[in-house]
Interface confidence: low
Amino acid sequence: IWELKKDVYVVELDWYPDAPGEMVVLTCDTPEEDGITWTLDQSSEVLGSGKTLTIQVKEFGDAGQYTCHKGGEVLSHSLLLLHKKEDGIWSTDILKDQKEPKNKTFLRCEAKNYSGRFTCWWLTTISTDLTFSVKSSRGSSDPQGVTCGAATLSAERVRGDNKEYEYSVECQEDSACPAAEESLPIEVMVDAVHKLKYENYTSSFFIRDIIKPDPPKNLQLKPLKNSRQVEVSWEYPDTWSTPHSYFSLTFCVQVQGKSKREKKDRVFTDKTSATVICRKNASISVRAQDRYYSSSWSEWASVPCS
Amino acid sequence: RAVPGGSSPAWTQCQQLSQKLCTLAWSAHPLVGHMDLREEGDEETTNDVPHIQCGDGCDPQGLRDNSQFCLQRIHQGLIFYEKLLGSDIFTGEPSLLPDSPVAQLHASLLGLSQLLQPEGHHWETQQIPSLSPSQPWQRLLLRFKILRSLQAFVAVAARVFAHGAATLSP
């Protein structure tokens, strides 16, 4: 058993049929010595008396808010949550496996630049009685500070018969050094509580590996005289790190016909313009990637050819 | 070429070669083994590999003030990786093809380090760990880790030379 926060405790249980459970001793936070009784949640049934209460925690029915009273007055509370371990593996019932980039990916994180700011998100089908708490650091043995905000509900989607909820959190490294080569990973820890179930999820990454630039901006076409060719130009996204002579991007320009089956023409360039042939009913798209490190491509920015 | 005493390197040549190094480091990566070792996470490891750190002056402001600190750091790293890529870790079984990107990467690391430091001028270089001849599982693991680490190192070096070529070239 360990303390998650003041008056909230997590009991770690091996979860299998007829498991013995864990013996837990609760102590009433009071100078009083006698006349103390204990109850669980809203029930008025007295579970025991005295300054301490010993309980055998085996299942969710044994978890909840234990309260000690004296003469009708509440003295203190202890909320017990359960953390299940099945066949040696901690339960992951609360969050959905996003399966990208690999199985057992519950947290996904992205950064728009090298400033030390990043966003993580996760999915769940649970709509109520759900709380999240996020902590982060750079490195784990001698951790350096990363400040995370509160997790918020950022999207709701319907997936078949189910509703899916996306939560996200923004974090910022306290003393970021955008130009340095990271040697210690960022660690992100999410505590999830659904009713009386506790679970924790972690992710470890380098900012360089989660970089995904915003799409290029101000995508424009300029027809070239007496030619089917056009000059496509664009700019670095506002959110990308500066100066651009240092934090350089590379670009992919694609000409795509109306039909998905039509052949795509692609050009790669380090410049912010390119000359391509504009076919009728086609569209031109441009996306960006860090020039020197193969992290994710941005989403496409597109304009029609006409 | 870099000249002892702190004058400028051939920024544009260094830019071109460092960008080539980035491409080679990423094309060499699939050759390091048949497994995805990212499963294991990038745990904190003993820092025997030289990293370009915050105080090394490799940021745009530091380069403007005095690029020599940063160039010396990059040179140290290039020599370190060049020696690693020439060691038993990469030359032993399971062997790589002679024309593999690793061989080209090895040559390019040497080329860039020579651009930064001509004959007769010696910056201090970091000691490379001496590793006894190792088994294939050890080599495969080390190749993967070394190339992952090299990708990050050459990315920073390439940014430095690109910025230098754009803003510090005579």
Partner: antibody
Framework: QVQLVQSGAEVKKPGSSVKVSCKAS????????ISWVRQAPGQGLEWMGG????????NYAQKFQGRVTITADESTSTAYMELSSLRSEDTAVYYC??????????WGQGTLVTVSS | DIVLTQSPATLSLSPGERATLSCRAS???????LAWYQQKPGQAPRLLIY???SRATGVPARFSGSGSGTDFTLTISSLEPEDFAVYYC?????????FGQGTKVEIK
């Protein structure tokens, strides 16, 4: 002459963890790898994983991935193998061995781990 | 992972006889990174042969290893009383090391 000395026998409850140590003397600890091999009563040898102390890099057999953690402390020339979520079938003798190009040439004396409720 | 199959499971011979132990791999063992170990009851294994055919330090000349690719053999030219034990082959040519299930050489 390199010698590997392992920690003593352990009795553990199902669901708990065990951490076995392996101290090297008489050689340069960092220059080679340490592998961990186990042997259940009356059974054969089973490789669990290994570590290259100089780099801190570990490699695990798929079967133990997520349950085993192999670490090394260069300052004390000691390697460690921690196995979590123990079950009765983890009852075995656990060996550490120096792992060089010529195979596992030096072995520890073995540590018996008994998992029983 | 490479699976190593040893045969026979048990070999019953008398001192002075020749013992031939076989180890077959499910796929080619790169660089012939194959080792043989001897294990006696209550003891740690002992390295006999590495690289398929090289004798480890202090191993008597009666022990020899041969083979390449997927088929390997350990030969004990003339069994001594102290040679009765279990013998394991092991491949270390891949990221994941594997052992054979063992061959027990017992006194007939």
């Amino acid at each position: 002459q390199v010698q590997l000395v392992q920690s003593g026998a352990e009795v553990k409850k199902p669901g708990s963890s065990v951490k076995v140590s392996c101290k090297a003397s008489g050689g340069t600890f960092s220059n080679y790898a340490i592998s961990w091999v186990r042997q259940a009563p009356g059974q054969g040898l089973e490789w669990m994983g290994g570590i290259i102390p100089m780099f801190g890099y570990a490699n695990y057999a798929q079967k133990f991935q997520g349950r085993v953690t192999i670490t090394a402390d260069e300052s004390t020339s000691t390697a460690y193998m921690e196995l979590s979520s123990l079950r009765s079938e983890d009852t075995a003798v656990y060996y550490c061995a120096r792992d060089i190009y010529a195979g596992m040439d030096v072995w520890g004396q073995g540590t018996l781990v008994t998992v029983s409720s | 992972d490479i699976v190593l199959t040893q045969s026979p499971a048990t070999l019953s011979l008398s001192p002075g006889e020749r013992a031939t132990l076989s180890c077959r791999a499910s796929q080619s063992v790169l660089g012939n990174y194959l080792a043989w170990y001897q294990q006696k009851p209550g003891q740690a294994p002992r390295l006999l042969i590495y690289g398929a055919s090289s004798r480890a330090t202090g191993v008597p000349a009666r022990f020899s290893g041969s083979g390449s690719g997927t088929d390997f053999t350990l030969t004990i030219s003339s069994l001594e009383p102290e040679d009765f034990a279990v013998y394991y082959c092991q491949q270390y040519s891949h990221l994941i090391i594997t052992f054979g299930q063992g061959t027990k050489v017992e006194i007939k």
